[in-house]
């Protein structure tokens, strides 16, 4: 019986470890600045790193600019988006800016997109200052189903800060769906 | 066999509880305003509370102004930094402020510091208003190794709001590294 | 013994699943804009959705405008609050605004309220721009006891953005108290 108990304990340790890891997908994606669209209108950001520097992904997929859920669950989603302008970059088209982020969810089954979180600010970036900066942070807890896709839309993409510590988004699974 | 099963169940409950608690380090550190450095340039904030009010720490260490990781894992890191100015608080030299936070990671093995997250804003705080306030929030999911250190750098430290609900940072472990 | 082991394994799977789910309360509450108070002073927001759109709750209770903790634990709390004004909404009483959020905890045993987190900004929303927007995000890790209540206070509630992706707050349990 002791041998059997040891076997039970052993298999349980394996099972616990395995199920724990399987149950916890995550991603932290950082902006790929080589392909940031221009303009001031709202655009979807499709170029993100998933495997360099701070960027990483596990049990989720990154494809076509979207973070794809592989496992049903409740996830904490977050995004940090930084905008900046230096006078050496040239004049702004307008001093009145709407700097916004939208974290959206798309279901393939029902091909529609819904905004989960939004944040931002209207800003007056006057020529009296040589440098302007603004960051947005949003986060929230959402039920995600396998196959659903998370994407990031921003206004004024040409003003994005391309640093990996500045512009990123991510998700981690917190618990299963009952 | 029933007794044996009960023993297995009991030991498993203990093991599960124990491993769960051991596997989840956390910290929530609040600003110690008695020792905020002066200057406008980027400075590292070294004085934080870890055991009063909302501040707490478990299975992590706070030493020399840095939050030290004791257990490998993936952690969610966050910081909330508030800046404020009242006309009675002191004299501003300029209306144009760069209010920033940088969450940095230092590895002792490779003595170098890297910024994990940054946020903030340039602000125009005019004398036409008697009170000014601004808060920054950043958060993200990062792989941390035992011995690595997390610290907070800010610009304009003398403008920091010293309340425990205003200026704080923290971390909690979400999962093991595979 | 094999049958017994299967029974152990089976009961353990049940126990693990059950205890895991029981151990992880959560809530994501979105603003109910049909009942937002007017004025510019700090008010407690009491109308939130808990069961429509992105709003959801499990193993916590929403009552009288407060999120009630049913299970001791360490929770990650967050809030995202958006303010907006369009010139078609009418004139602002003042161009100088203090747009703030306070996440508070009330203990029934000791009937007192304490602010866990605050964030926001003073803003100058001049008539030169037809639209103004600003979002605040706060988050932090707190020990909550059964019966304690979380509520949200804001300044300038009449400027709140009523969208479910804009103004919300939530919590999820991360770990037990030792």
């Amino acid at each position: 019986i002791r041998a059997e108990k040891a076997m039970v304990d052993g298999s349980w340790l394996d099972l616990a470890k395995r199920s724990k890891l399987e149950a916890q997908p995550f991603a932290h994606l950082t902006i790929n600045a080589t392909d940031i669209p221009s303009g001031s209108h709202k655009v979807s950001l499709s170029s993100w790193y998933h495997d360099r520097g701070w960027a990483k992904i596990s049990n989720m997929t990154f494809s076509n600019g979207k973070l794809i859920v592989n496992q049903d669950g409740f996830y904490y989603l977050y995004a940090n988006i930084c905008f900046r302008h230096h006078e050496t970059s040239g004049d702004l088209a307008t001093e009145y800016l709407q700097l916004m982020v939208y974290v959206t969810k798309t279901s393939i089954k029902i091909p529609s997109s819904h905004t989960l979180m939004k944040g931002g600010s209207t800003k007056y970036w006057s020529g009296n200052s040589e440098f302007h900066f603004y960051s947005i942070n949003v986060g929230g807890f959402f039920k995600l189903r396998s196959g659903e896709e998370i994407s990031i839309e921003v206004s004024n993409p040409s003003l994005l800060d391309p640093d990996q510590d500045a512009t990123y988004f991510g998700a981690f699974k917190v618990r299963d769906i009952d | 066999i029933r007794a044996e099963k009960a023993m297995v169940d009991g030991s498993w409950l203990d093991l599960a509880k124990r491993s769960k608690l051991e596997a989840q380090p956390f910290a929530h550190l609040t600003i110690n305003a008695t020792d905020i450095p002066s200057g406008s340039h980027k400075v590292s904030l070294s004085s934080w509370y870890h055991d009063r009010g909302w501040a707490k720490i478990s299975n992590m260490t706070f030493s020399n102004g840095k939050l030290i990781v004791n257990q490998d894992g993936f952690y969610y890191l966050y910081a909330n930094i508030c800046f404020r100015h009242h006309e009675t608080s002191g004299d501003l030299a300029t209306e144009y402020l760069q209010l920033m936070v940088y969450v940095t990671k230092t590895s002792i093995k490779i003595p170098s510091s890297h910024t994990l997250m940054k946020g903030g804003s340039t602000k125009y705080w005019s004398g036409n208003s008697e009170f000014h306030f601004y808060s920054i929030n950043v958060g993200g999911f990062f792989k941390l190794r035992s011995g690595e250190e997390i610290s907070i750098e800010v610009s304009n430290p003398s403008l920091l709001d010293p309340d425990q609900d205003a200026t704080y940072f923290g971390a909690f472990k979400v999962r093991d590294i595979d | 013994i094999r049958a017994e082991k299967a029974m152990v394994d089976g009961s353990w799977l049940d126990l693990a699943k059950r205890s895991k789910l029981e151990a992880q309360p959560f809530a994501h509450l979105t603003i109910n804009a049909t009942d937002i108070p007017s004025g510019s002073h700090k008010v407690s927001l009491s109308s939130w959705y808990h069961d429509r759109g992105w709003a959801k709750i499990s193993n916590m209770t929403f009552s009288n405008g407060k999120l009630i903790v049913n299970q001791d634990g360490f929770y990650y709390l967050y809030a995202n609050i958006c303010f907006r004004h369009h010139e078609t909404s009418g004139d602002l009483a003042t161009e100088y605004l203090q747009l703030m959020v306070y996440v508070t905890k009330t203990s029934i045993k000791i009937p007192s309220s304490h602010t866990l987190m605050k964030g926001g900004s003073t803003k100058y929303w001049s008539g030169n721009s037809e639209f103004h927007f600003y979002s605040i995000n706060v988050g932090g890790f707190f020990k909550l006891r059964s019966g304690e209540e979380i509520s949200i206070e804001v300044s300038n509630p009449s400027l709140l953005d009523p969208d479910q992706d804009a103004t919300y707050f939530g919590a999820f349990k991360v770990r037990d108290i030792d």
Partner: antibody, heavy 121, light 107 residues
Amino acid sequence: EVQLVESGGDLVKPGGSLKLSCAASGFTFSRYGMSWVRQTPDKRLEWVATISSGGSYIYYPDSVKGRFTISRDNAKNTLYLQMSSLKSEDTAMYYCARLDGYNYRWYFDVWGTGTTVTVSS
Amino acid sequence: DIVMTQSHKFMSTSVGDRVSITCKASQDVSTAVAWYQQKPGQSPKLLIYSASYRYTGVPDRFTGSGSGTDFTFTISSVQAEDLAVYYCQQHYSSPRTFGGGTNLEIK
């Protein structure tokens, strides 16, 4: 090269007025707070007035409050100090100084060459 | 007002010596103390700010230390050109106040 050059110092009778100027060059004047600091004949240094980069914050010590007015013209890169109801204890070398430290903890990182004000009957 | 006291009005030293000038604040000023050098016939120059930060271009023989109420300015190896009056100043709060100065003489 960063330079501050003061002018306007003179001999003036008690109760009289005088306006000092400080011409700035070599840096973006409109982005810095500025101050006047004086050095008395016994070589003591005394802060006299401060104006923020945009001109909306102005500060004085009690010793000159109501008598001295600091101002600036960012378009001309010039700082001014209008002094009235002058007293003999206002006799000093007046320096214009640039501020560093974008908050309460500012100090004087660049000083001008100075201009002499003598208040005597 | 915060009073800054430099106890030595004069100090005499030789080239190559190490010399320390002290400054005491009448109340806690954290680390908000600056040190200035004024050579004969010249305007003051910033050497140290926030107690220990060397201003741009200042030689590393000049150092500052201290916090709270007691501050020290040190020249590790005095040079002939260091002949000057050295002033401390608190930049903690207004009104900004200076010490009376310490006149460093070279023997």
